[in-house]
């Protein structure tokens, strides 16, 4: 079945971050082209990348419309012409990706320090609130719009004179930590969503130590 | 000879649905992706909706997804465009055209069918 | 999308002289593992609907006079009539077939001076 001299696509794989997707999938195409579909369980299927001749389509815009339902993508192969000079042997090969559940699933971008600012004893250091392609009302959502109270942030953090690290938990985007007056701290930012079985946590943000630029730490 | 023959065009109020066909002969229609492209009065080309020879793949323009259905019914030789929601900038002469040598590169048009959306 | 820009938009050239039309794409309707230019040109008559001149940039559709030729390349393309005649007198458009949703150039009117 299929038609001839096309192959069909395989190793289908969503890449996905902070709800950007791109479904991913071999093999370049050698006289043929592409189309990618996506459905949720339910609905009707939706055709993406029309005949192309990329190996990734974004499916962002079908997945952010509620990243909570569990899709389903497949790639169609059709022949690098009309079927009439090319052949057919009936309906176009196709290969059906995994189901993926953005909500459960998307992995969670590096995080990035906002900010820290020392008050005597305290050093209140702030997460950025990263924005995603999520929208309610015509606005884009951040992380913490989409995530509410599943999504907490881990610190760790340590003198710069020694390795030994300690750590903080946040269910907001802000920690409060006790430091030693005169003293030099640095620390990383880890997103974490406990109630996951996969991708439950994000990269380590890059590390901040106190009295210098940010970013210029070197270890 | 390869021939396309648009109908269905008409005057339609703002909101109302119309539904074109495209009876094409001539040539093996279910080997062939077939597309809408219209052609507002004194305007440029616009290209609307395509269809893949197999009926399972459609895609649309911006302006009319959502709004237009394009369907085909490959034992009937017929090519369809279900047009919702009419608005006046809707108005235009409707082509329906074969793929030629390659996706997107029309070797054959039809003569077309106008649709005027006015109240 | 890929916008296609036509210039100029009406040419008027006395009968057997050189007709240029340029088209230029907002990115790039090369595929570099065949190395081909999705873009096609077509002429439209008062009244009727578009014929194919062109397609791949360069390959004239068969029976289409020698007197048409496509060049160019990446993102800037010219269609040349080479010796003007009389049933020459249309609009010309271009597009690109690299990518959905396909978009054809405004159109170029020739007429003769």
């Known amino acids: 079945s299929g038609t001839t001299n096309t192959v069909a696509a395989y190793n289908l794989t969503w890449k996905s971050t902070n709800f950007k997707t791109i479904l991913e999938w071999e093999p370049k195409p050698v006289n043929q082209v592409y189309t990618v579909q996506i459905s949720t369980k339910s609905g009707d299927w939706k055709s993406k990348c029309f005949y192309t001749t990329d190996t990734e389509c974004d499916l962002t815009d079908e997945i952010v419309k509620d990243v909570k339902q569990t899709y389903l993508a497949r790639v169609f192969s059709y022949p690098a012409g009309n079927v009439e000079s090319t052949g057919s042997a009936g309906e176009p090969l196709y290969e059906n990706s995994p189901e993926f559940t953005p909500y459960l699933e998307t992995n969670l971008g590096q995080p990035t320090i906002q900010s820290f600012e020392q008050v005597g004893t305290k050093v209140n250091v702030t997460v950025e609130d990263e924005r995603t392609l999520v929208r309610r009302n015509n606005t884009f959502l951040s992380l913490r719009d989409v995530f509410g109270k599943d999504l907490i942030y881990t610190l760790y953090y340590w003198k710069s004179s020694s390795s030994g690290k300690k750590t903080a938990k946040t269910n907001t985007n802000e920690f409060l930590i006790d430091v030693e007056k005169g003293v030099s701290y640095c620390f990383f930012a880890q997103a974490v969503i406990p109630s996951r079985t996969v991708n439950r946590k994000s990269t380590d943000s890059p590390v901040e130590c106190m009295g210098q630029e940010k970013g210029e730490f070197r270890e | 000879q390869v021939q396309l023959v648009e109908s269905g065009g008409g005057v339609v109020q703002p909101g109302r649905s119309l539904r074109l066909s495209c009876a094409a002969s001539?040539?093996?229609?279910?080997?062939?992706?077939m597309h809408w492209v219209r052609q507002a009065p004194g305007k440029g080309l616009e290209w609307v909706a395509v269809i893949t020879y197999d009926g399972i793949n459609k895609y649309y323009a911006d302006s009319v997804e959502g709004r237009f259905t394009i369907s085909r019914d490959n034992s009937k030789n017929t090519l369809y465009l279900q047009m919702n929601s009419l608005r006046a900038e809707d108005t235009a002469v409707y082509y329906c055209?074969?793929?030629?040598?390659?996706?997107?590169?029309?070797?054959?048009w039809g003569q077309g069918t106008l649709v005027t959306v006015s109240s | 999308d890929i916008v296609m820009t036509q210039s100029p938009d009406s040419l008027a050239v006395s009968l057997g002289e050189r007709a240029t039309i340029n088209c230029k794409s907002s990115q790039s309707v090369l595929f570099s593992s065949n190395n081909k230019n999705y873009l096609a040109w077509y002429q439209q008559k008062p009244g009727q609907p578009p014929k194919l001149l062109i397609y791949?940039?360069?390959t004239r559709e068969s029976g289409v006079p020698d007197r048409f030729s496509g060049s160019g390349s990446g993102t800037d393309f010219t269609l040349t009539i080479s010796s003007l005649q009389a049933e020459d007198v249309a609009v010309y458009y271009c597009?690109?077939?690299?990518?959905?949703?396909?978009?054809f150039g405004g159109g170029t009117k020739v007429e003769i001076k």
């Open positions: 597009q690109q077939f690299h990518s959905y949703p396909l978009t």
């Open positions: 791949w940039a360069s």
């Open positions: 055209a074969r793929d030629g040598v390659y996706y997107g590169v029309y070797d054959y």
């Open positions: 001539g040539f093996t229609f279910r080997s062939y992706g």
